[in-house]
């Protein structure tokens, strides 16, 4: 339905508060370096303009597209050239090229200072002094650091952030109340950002068809009682929502997401029995709840798939005359029967099935050719099962920190060209799969683990894309979205890598390490471990373990010393010499 003024339409649909929040998120995700005050000023100007359009949709410029209005506003920023360099060239373009240009300049790893959490009393004072500014600042800081954060979900995080301060700033022990909540929001926020980044990468790098296939598989697992037409409708609507958010169309995205939640709740009887509680919640909570809802029970009386997709002699006729419906139905039927499989595995099976039909339907005896297609699935299913079993055993044996270290070594040897901070970040996240998924029973391990690994490896892919240094990473990231994890798993030690020159400075530590949190201290040690492997990629596990044990003992000893700095200087030299000898550097 066409509206005379798109901006008025969205303002009315979303309400002023959400409108302003979403415009702030949009601007902060595009201009990630701009100061908070500048963004607030731009948002206020856009909001005032939107109000004039609500009053009179025929007013000047009210008929312009949101991209035109927002782009024009962004291009008024005086310091665009100095701050963003070539991004300023976007402003010379016309829509839709200008928006595409802004999108291409989104930075997954912006050069921004780490967010340091102030003292609780300081935060509570700021919250009470100006609640609105405090919450806007939260949106701004998250959005600029996570330029693909799912905007309507960020509104939900902001609501929880506000609730935490409202409750805890009047608690007897403010810190005990607030800090765990903030930690939880931070961790959930990082996870949410990474999950959405994969959705956007899927759409942008592999196209709508890839995203729709992912959505068919996931929604069929989640709503196995829903019929194919229902799942297809949800997939179409969900694809529109994510295409809009990934494309910077945040007002449309939030509006359409609300409509989708409304539709799902109005039709929950034909979708899932698990939606009742979600649908009783207010909008933001409702949408979040639906997105996280547990899988419904599988319907009774599902016959074997082999009859329709393998045993029938008419498979090729059905495939040839209705390719997308036939393959979509295959994926839907397979996924609803297999909540125990990861989405990426289901997509690999569907791709194998499609490839087999492409080959066999051109053969002399098609039925004979595709008759054993389900046998080809067996190794594809067993590969992630075995990998998860082995890695969960290793995790249970080592614990999270040492498991992360094992992965750090493994991945540094595979792709030693990748920057140390990226290897540390990605390997630490890969290692979290253990505590996240290994506790689950067999039936839930694979969907938990492999789909989580897809999210983490996508982080590696987007960070590497910014500054490509490894052909092997590029190859695994670009060849096939669903085969990324098997591609990385299959990488052996990079024999072409020339070891990094030894630099004593890299292994020089100071007393400041003693005041770091346990997590920060781990990161320091893991950074050193990556550097060790880069210097000595052929080092054995035993050699590396010995050096790391010595290093841990050295840090512990010097942090207990009276003169810490002298200890770090003197003992550090000895440690470097001993390590060099142990590793033959």
């Amino acid at each position: 339905d066409a509206h005379k003024s798109e901006v008025a339409h969205r303002f009315k649909d979303l309400g002023e508060e959400n409108f302003k929040a979403l415009v702030l998120i949009a601007f902060a995700q595009y201009l990630q370096q701009c100061p908070f005050e500048d963004h607030v000023k731009l948002v206020n100007e856009v909001t005032e303009f939107a109000k004039t359009c609500v009053a009179d949709e025929s007013a000047e410029n009210c008929d312009k597209s949101l991209h035109t209005l927002f782009g024009d506003k962004l291009c008024t920023v005086a310091t665009l050239r100095e701050t963003y360099g070539e991004m300023a060239d976007c402003c010379a373009k016309q829509e839709p090229e200008r928006n595409e240009c802004f999108l291409q300049h989104k930075d997954d790893n912006p050069n921004l200072p780490r967010l340091v959490r102030p003292e609780v009393d300081v935060m509570c004072t700021a919250f009470h002094d100006n609640e609105e500014t405090f919450l806007k600042k939260y949106l701004y800081e998250i959005a600029r650091r996570h330029p693909y954060f799912y905007a309507p979900e960020l509104l939900f995080f902001a609501k929880r952030y506000k609730a935490a301060f409202t409750e805890c700033c009047q608690a007897a022990d403010k810190a005990a109340c607030l800090l765990p909540k903030l930690d939880e929001l931070r961790d959930e926020g990082k996870a949410s950002s990474a999950k959405q980044r994969l959705k956007c990468a899927s759409l942008q790098k592999f196209g709508e068809r890839a995203f729709k296939a992912w959505a068919v598989a996931r929604l069929s697992q989640r709503f196995p009682k829903a019929e194919f037409a229902e799942v297809s409708k949800l997939v179409t609507d969900l694809t529109k929502v994510h295409t809009e958010c990934c494309h910077g169309d945040l007002l449309e995205c939030a509006d359409d997401r609300a409509d989708l939640a409304k539709y799902i709740c109005e039709n929950q009887d034909s979708i899932s029995s698990k939606l009742k509680e979600c649908c009783e919640k207010p909008l933001l909570e409702k949408s979040h709840c639906i997105a996280e809802v547990e899988n419904d029970e599988m319907p009774a009386d599902l016959p074997s798939l082999a009859a329709d997709f393998v045993e029938s002699k008419d498979v090729c006729k059905n495939y040839a005359e209705a390719k997308d419906v036939f393959l979509g139905m295959f994926l839907y039927e397979y996924a609803r029967r297999h909540p125990d499989y990861s989405v990426v595995l289901l997509l690999r099976l569907a791709k194998t099935y499609e490839t087999t039909l492409e080959k066999c339907c051109a053969a002399a005896d098609p039925h004979e050719c595709y008759a054993k297609v389900f046998d080809e699935f067996k190794p594809l299913v067993e590969e992630p099962q075995n990998l998860i079993k082995q890695n969960c055993e290793l995790f249970e044996q080592l614990g999270e920190y040492k498991f992360q270290n094992a992965l750090l070594v493994r991945y540094t040897k595979k792709v030693p060209q990748v920057s140390t901070p990226t290897l540390v970040e990605v390997s630490r996240n890969l290692g979290k799969v253990g505590s996240k998924c290994c506790k689950h029973p067999e039936a839930k391990r694979m969907p938990c683990a492999e789909d989580y690994l897809s999210v983490v490896l996508n982080q590696l892919c987007v960070l590497h894309e910014k500054t490509p240094v490894s052909d092997r990473v590029t190859k695994c990231c670009t060849e096939s979205l669903v085969n990324r994890r098997p591609c990385f798993s299959a990488l052996e030690v990079d024999e072409t890598y020339v070891p990094k020159e030894f630099n004593a400075e890299t292994f020089t530590f100071h007393a400041d390490i003693c005041t770091l949190s346990e997590k920060e201290r781990q990161i320091k040690k893991q950074t050193a471990l990556v550097e060790l492997v880069k210097h000595k990629p052929k080092a054995t596990k035993e050699q590396l373990k010995a050096v790391m044990d010595d290093f841990a003992a050295f840090v512990e000893k010097c942090c207990k010393a009276d003169d810490k700095e002298t200890c770090f200087a003197e003992e550090g030299k000895k440690l470097v010499a001993a390590s060099q000898a142990a590793l033959g550097l």
């Epitope: 194919f228 229902e230 002699k313 059905n318 139905m329």
Partner: antibody, heavy 120, light 107 residues
């Protein structure tokens, strides 16, 4: 409630035509292969044909040419067009839902049937 | 393919164990269903994929077989079980075939 309701049956002269309808409620026809099955008085069940989710129709050998199955997803209805009717086409005509979009069986959901009588 | 059901009629008493067979003219793997039909009603699905019991159907009904030879067994006949039983073969192509039925009556 999930159900199928057939209509359009009645008495027709030999050589005449009839179009039967099967209206679905509680589910979307487009998700399933929809079948027509008939049963002459005191006789066996006889499969006529189906239209699958890809809109491809298949027929029993004896039904090809005289019988045509189609559907209108917007009306959530499947049709059976019967031409050149003969006395031996007298039967109860059932509509039945396949297990999936490309399934030829089994049929868990059936309509109550509509009676067709061909006689002069 | 064709399906041959036997016997075409059968008389039995409440509590009896009853077996009906269905033979396919060619292999249909396990793609066979069994239906129960009572006068004036549409058929009701009892068993699919040769041996899987449809939800809500009493466990006294069971199916077995694969390839060309299939069996429906009622372990202990109840009064409501007197009806006509049909087998259906499916899956080998986009066509399907019914057997001609076995009428089960009270002895």
């Amino acid at each position: 409630e999930v159900q199928l309701v057939e209509s359009g049956g009645g008495r027709v002269q030999p050589g005449g035509s009839l179009r039967l309808s099967c209206a679905a409620s509680g589910f979307s026809l487009s998700s399933y292969a929809m079948n027509w099955v008939r049963q002459a008085p005191g006789k066996c069940l006889e499969w006529i044909g189906h239209i699958n989710a890809g809109d491809i129709a298949y027929y029993a050998t004896w039904a090809k040419g005289r019988f045509t199955i189609s559907r209108d997803n917007s009306k959530n209805t499947v049709y059976l067009q019967m031409n050149s009717l003969r006395a031996e086409d007298t039967a109860t005509y059932f509509c039945a839902r396949g297990a999936g979009g490309f399934s030829t069986g089994p049929f868990k959901l059936w309509g109550q049937g509509t009676q067709v009588t061909v006689s002069s | 393919f064709e399906l041959t059901q036997s016997p075409s009629s059968l008389s039995a008493s409440v509590g009896d164990r009853v077996t009906i067979t269905c033979q396919a003219s060619e292999s249909i793997n396990s793609r066979l269903a069994w239906y129960q039909q009572k006068p004036g009603q549409p058929p009701k699905l009892l068993i699919y994929d040769a041996s899987d019991l449809t939800s809500g159907v009493p466990s006294r009904f069971s199916g077995s077989g694969s390839g060309t030879d299939f069996t429906l067994t009622i372990s202990s006949l109840q009064p409501e079980d007197f009806a006509t039983y049909y087998c259906q073969g499916y899956g080998g192509s986009s066509t399907t075939t019914f057997g001609c039925g076995t009428k089960l009556t009270v002895l």
